[in-house]
Interface confidence: low
């Protein structure tokens, strides 16, 4: 009679995480008498997966009834597969012995590969805000997927980005993998409503990629533009000067009026108006009593936006002329108007 052979017909089996893996094994003879054991790995370090004779293996069930005398099917099912279950599984026939059974013949092995979905991509931006025209970096991370092949794309408002670097770890064989990508994005003044999207496509996702998003509103700082104008006279000896603070983001803004370098009033932006692009406008006004000044007055609107160094715009108010004559002046006509940083 021909010597018993252990047949493992499947060289490899691919199973999705969470599903059940069927590892097939048949023997060609009932002789010699003895149990079957399943191992993961070969050699002295192999891991016992199932022992027909004894032990408790809650995740393993047999395909056939191994208690039947003429059974030669030793296939097993392993439930709730995880990436950690990946490896080569060997079906091994033992010959009944005393005191211990003796290993008789092993199957050729079945490589179990686990398809595991990537975790939802997590996109994170820079720790500090940046202004338009600056380049900022966004990172995208996704973990726990298998096999290693994966595609990652970056988008800004639906437009695909090309300036990014992606690494998949580990480089060698592993039960599951992680992806890390860093994209560079150039900010524009219109980016308050913009979104950066990281899209991950993997065989386990069946054509429905996972996306992670970051709002550029968390990243961008749009500095304000200032315009100081002199309004028509409200009353005799009184001039109304306004400071238009336009196109800024975020809202956090403090404005200080200076008369000849002395602080006149400080206020915080509250009732702002929002522009279509998500930036804000705000206006502050100062009523100046011209009769209280003997000389020309330099009025400065100084703005501190989002904790940044202050910017300012000045307006020269000539007290020698009659206030009514000055009412028609615009900022453009004020050659003394200037912008500077206050440190």
């Amino acid at each position: 009679e021909e010597e018993l052979q252990v047949i493992q017909p499947d060289k490899s089996v691919l199973v999705a995480a969470g599903e059940t893996a069927t590892l097939r094994c048949t023997a060609t003879s009932l002789i010699p008498v003895g149990p079957i054991q399943w191992f993961r790995g070969a050699g002295p370090g192999r891991e016992l997966i199932y022992n027909q004779k004894e032990g408790h293996f809650p995740r393993v069930t047999t395909v056939s009834d191994l208690t039947k005398r003429n059974n030669m099917d030793f296939s097993i099912r392993i439930g709730n597969i995880t990436p950690a279950d990946a490896g080569t599984y060997y079906c091994v026939k033992f010959r009944k012995g005393s005191p211990d059974d003796v290993e008789f013949k092993s199957g050729a092995g079945t490589e179990l590969s686990v398809r595991a979905k990537p975790s939802a991509p997590v996109v994170s931006g820079p720790a500090a805000r940046a202004t338009p025209q600056h380049t900022v970096s966004f990172t995208c991370e996704s973990h726990g997927f298998s096999p290693r092949d994966i595609t990652l794309k970056w988008f800004k408002n639906g437009n695909e980005l090309s300036d990014f670097q992606t690494n998949v770890d580990p480089v060698g064989e592993s039960v599951s993998y992680s992806i890390h990508s860093t994209a560079k994005v150039v900010l524009t003044r219109e980016d308050v409503h913009s979104q950066v999207i990281c899209e991950v496509a993997h065989v386990t996702l069946q054509g429905d990629p996972l996306r992670g998003t970051a709002n550029l509103s968390e990243t961008i700082r749009v500095p304000p533009t200032l315009e100081v104008t002199q309004q028509p006279v409200r009353a005799e000896n009184q001039v109304n000067v306004t400071c238009q603070v336009r196109k800024f983001y975020p809202q956090r803004l403090q404005l200080t009026w200076l008369e000849n370098g002395n602080v006149s009033r400080t206020e915080t932006a509250s009732t702002v108006t929002e522009n279509k692009d998500g930036t804000y406008n705000w206006m502050s006004w100062l009523l100046v009593n011209v009769s209280a000044h003997r000389d020309d007055v330099k009025l400065t609107c100084q703005v501190e936006h989002d904790g940044q160094p202050a910017v300012s715009k000045s307006h020269d108010l000539k007290v020698s002329a009659h206030p009514k004559e000055q009412g028609s002046n615009t900022a453009a006509e004020n050659t003394g108007s200037n912008e500077r940083n206050i440190y």
């Epitope: 993961r40 790995g41 370090g45 192999r46 891991e47 016992l48 950690a84 490896g87 997590v122 994170s124 990172t139 991370e141 973990h143 726990g144 580990p170 060698g172 064989e173 592993s174 039960v175 599951s176 992680s178």
Partner: antibody, heavy 116, light 108 residues
């Protein structure tokens, strides 16, 4: 990635101490964090861990005495140590735990001395 | 608890030599082993994870291998900066995570 521990010092047996670890350079809330200690002249011993989701894990010798916690808004990991014993004397390292349960970044450590 | 036994405890070698450190686990850990290097007065530094994957920035002279219960860390040509204590750690089981006792690599 940077991890900075603080809060170590000399404490009497039975006393308490709270260690802090401030993290930067990565998205703190997404990662597991851990405390690993090293007694003078000895090897490394894992003490406790907190997963990104907030689940907590302890080695048997500190269960019931130590409490790990985290404040994701402050990027800070804590270890509240009560009923301290002489055998708790060690350098306590804060470490970032990868998704695969090893430690890819470590702080410089803070020394805890339990002595009367 | 998974117990890790490192051998030898101390290894005296000369620069340029090949070094092999062993870490044995008390049960199968599915290749979930990490190796760390620790120099005096410093924190440990990750070298290898998943038994054979090199961590970021680790020179190619460091390599890991093994499966089941026996794992090795090999340094092909020992440099002066490699004299340190090396620890293995299993990252297979959380309850608890365990380290080996360490192997000190010293100058002969």
């Amino acid at each position: 990635v940077q991890l900075v521990e603080s809060g170590g010092g000399l404490v009497q047996p039975g006393g308490s101490l709270r260690l802090s670890c401030t993290a930067s350079g990565f998205t703190f809330r997404n990662y597991g964090m851990s405390w690993v200690r090293q007694a003078p002249g000895e090897g490394l011993e894992w003490v406790s861990a907190s997963s990104g989701s907030g689940s907590t894990y302890y080695t048997d010798s500190v269960k019931g005495r130590f409490t790990i916690s985290r404040d994701n808004s402050k990027n800070t990991l804590y270890l509240q140590m009560n009923s301290l014993r002489a055998e708790d004397t060690a350098i306590y390292y804060c470490a970032k735990v990868t998704w695969n349960n090893f430690f890819d970044y470590w702080g410089l450590g803070t020394l805890v001395t339990v002595s009367s | 608890e998974i117990v890790l036994t490192q051998s030898p405890g101390t290894l005296s070698v000369s620069p340029g030599e090949r070094v092999t450190l062993t870490c044995r686990a008390s049960q199968g850990i599915a290749g979930k082993i990490a190796w760390y290097q620790q120099k005096p007065g410093q924190a440990p530094r990750l070298l290898i994870y998943d038994a054979s994957s090199r961590a970021t920035g680790i020179p190619g002279r460091f390599s890991g291998s093994g499966s089941g219960t026996e794992f090795t860390l090999t340094i092909t040509s020992l440099q002066s900066e490699d004299f340190a204590v090396y620890y293995c750690q299993q990252h297979y089981d959380w309850s608890p995570l365990t380290f080996g006792g360490g192997t000190k690599v010293e100058i002969k």
